[in-house]
């Protein structure tokens, strides 16, 4: 009778993480009598995966009944596969011995490769806000995928970006890999509604890439433009002065009126109007009683936006018998009546 051979028909097996791997092994003879064992790796450091005779291997089940007489099928299934299970598995026949069984013959080995999906990409932007025309960096990270081959793309509002650098770690062989990419984005005033998207494509995703997003509203600061105007006379000896605060983002804004350099009133932007591009407009106005003044008055609208240094705009109010109409009427943007009589 021919000497027993251990046949592992599959040189390699590819399994998705979380699924079950079947490792096939058959013997060509029942002789010599003795158990089989499965190992991962070869040599003295090999790891025991299954022992027919003894031990507890909760993730391993045999395909056939190894206790059955004449059984020569020693295939096993390993459940809930993870990338850490990757490696070469050997089916080894032992010959019954005393006191210990003796290794008789090994199969050629089956390489188990594990396909693991990348984690959802996480996109993070700069810690501090930046203003239009500035370049900011965004990072994208995804972990735990295998095999190593992966594609990463950046988009801004659907337009692919080209200014980015990507690394996949580790460089050498590993059970799973991570990707890290940094993209540079130039901000514009219209970017409040913009999105930056990191897209990851991998063989495990079957053509349906994973995406991570960052809203530029978390990154951009659009400073306001100020315009101070004198409105027509509202009543005898009263002048309406408005400060138009336009195209700012985010909403956090504080406005202070100064008369001849002295603080007259401070208020916080509340009832703002939103522009189509996501920026805000706001208007504050002041009623000035000019009859109480002998000299001209310098009115200053000072705005502190999002914790930045204040910007201001001034208007010289001429004290004369009949104040002239100045500026334009933008009552549609009027947000409230802030009356101030000057005595």
């Amino acid at each position: 009778e021919e000497e027993l051979q251990v046949i592992q028909p599959d040189k390699s097996v590819l399994v998705a993480a979380g699924e079950t791997a079947t490792l096939r092994c058959t013997a060509t003879s029942l002789i010599p009598v003795g158990p089989i064992q499965w190992f991962r790796g070869a040599g003295p450091g090999r790891e025991l995966i299954y022992n027919q005779k003894e031990g507890h291997f909760p993730r391993v089940t045999t395909v056939s009944d190894l206790t059955k007489r004449n059984n020569m099928d020693f295939s096993i299934r390993i459940g809930n596969i993870t990338p850490a299970d990757a490696g070469t598995y050997y089916c080894v026949k032992f010959r019954k011995g005393s006191p210990d069984d003796v290794e008789f013959k090994s199969g050629a080995g089956t390489e188990l490769s594990v396909r693991a999906k990348p984690s959802a990409p996480v996109v993070s932007g700069p810690a501090a806000r930046a203003t239009p025309q500035h370049t900011v960096s965004f990072t994208c990270e995804s972990h735990g995928f295998s095999p190593r081959d992966i594609t990463l793309k950046w988009f801004k509002n659907g337009n692919e970006l080209s200014d980015f650098q990507t690394n996949v770690d580790p460089v050498g062989e590993s059970v799973s890999y991570s990707i890290h990419s940094t993209a540079k984005v130039v901000l514009t005033r219209e970017d409040v509604h913009s999105q930056v998207i990191c897209e990851v494509a991998h063989v495990t995703l079957q053509g349906d890439p994973l995406r991570g997003t960052a809203n530029l509203s978390e990154t951009i600061r659009v400073p306001p433009t100020l315009e101070v105007t004198q409105q027509p006379v509202r009543a005898e000896n009263q002048v309406n002065v408005t400060c138009q605060v336009r195209k700012f983002y985010p909403q956090r804004l504080q406005l202070t009126w100064l008369e001849n350099g002295n603080v007259s009133r401070t208020e916080t932007a509340s009832t703002v109007t939103e522009n189509k591009d996501g920026t805000y407009n706001w208007m504050s106005w002041l009623l000035v009683n000019v009859s109480a003044h002998r000299d001209d008055v310098k009115l200053t609208c000072q705005v502190e936006h999002d914790g930045q240094p204040a910007v201001s705009k001034s208007h010289d109010l001429k004290v004369s018998a009949h104040p002239k109409e100045q500026g334009s009427n933008t009552a549609a943007e009027n947000t409230g009546s802030n009356e101030r009589n000057i005595y």
Epitope: I31, T67, R69, N70
Partner: antibody, heavy 123, light 105 residues
Amino acid sequence: VTLDESGGGLQTPGGALSLVCKGSGFTFSSHAMNWVRQAPGKGLEWVAGISSDGRFTYYGAAVQGRATISRDNGQSTVRLQLNNLRAEDTATYYCTKNGGCGSGGDLDCIDAWGHGTEVIVSS
Amino acid sequence: ALTQPASVSANPGETVEITCSGGGSNNAYGWFQQKSPGSAPLTVIYDNGKRPSDIPSRFSGSKSDSTGTLTITRVQAEDEAVYYCGSADNSGAGVFGAGTTLTVL
């Protein structure tokens, strides 16, 4: 080692029976179990067998498709259910234990027998 | 089914052999003693040559090629019984022989 069968008695043709065997005096979960029957005046006939962990079951040709063998290692019991009973199922049914070898159907490994339970299928 | 002789006989003190063939390739044989119809069989040999602890050493089993043999040395009157051999066929199904009646003269 003790194997106690129960569940026999008079059965009607076309009906179903459920035999239970309780094992004691040995590590039940380590041994394959078989059911063997003997019709009056006849020899021994293998009916069904089950592996020690219960994952694998085996059936004789005469009962294939009508029988189900199962085991509960926690309760140290093995059960044989036989449906669509026929007159030729009339026999004494023995529960057997395998020694430290073989599985269901490997009769060379039987090392212990129960006392048997008699089943009569008759209208 | 397995093939075994329908009957054998021996005088007390003699040695008797009962053969069994037809098991699956490389399979083993077990031997079961039944003293009367309806009484529970008793295993005298399993796994070719293993003897349960309560079985006298006069009973032994062996296998050569594909034939199993039950040997009873120094036969006694109480050994009179029907002896069945058991194994599995190549498909894994359990099979018994038709039984051999041992008569002690």
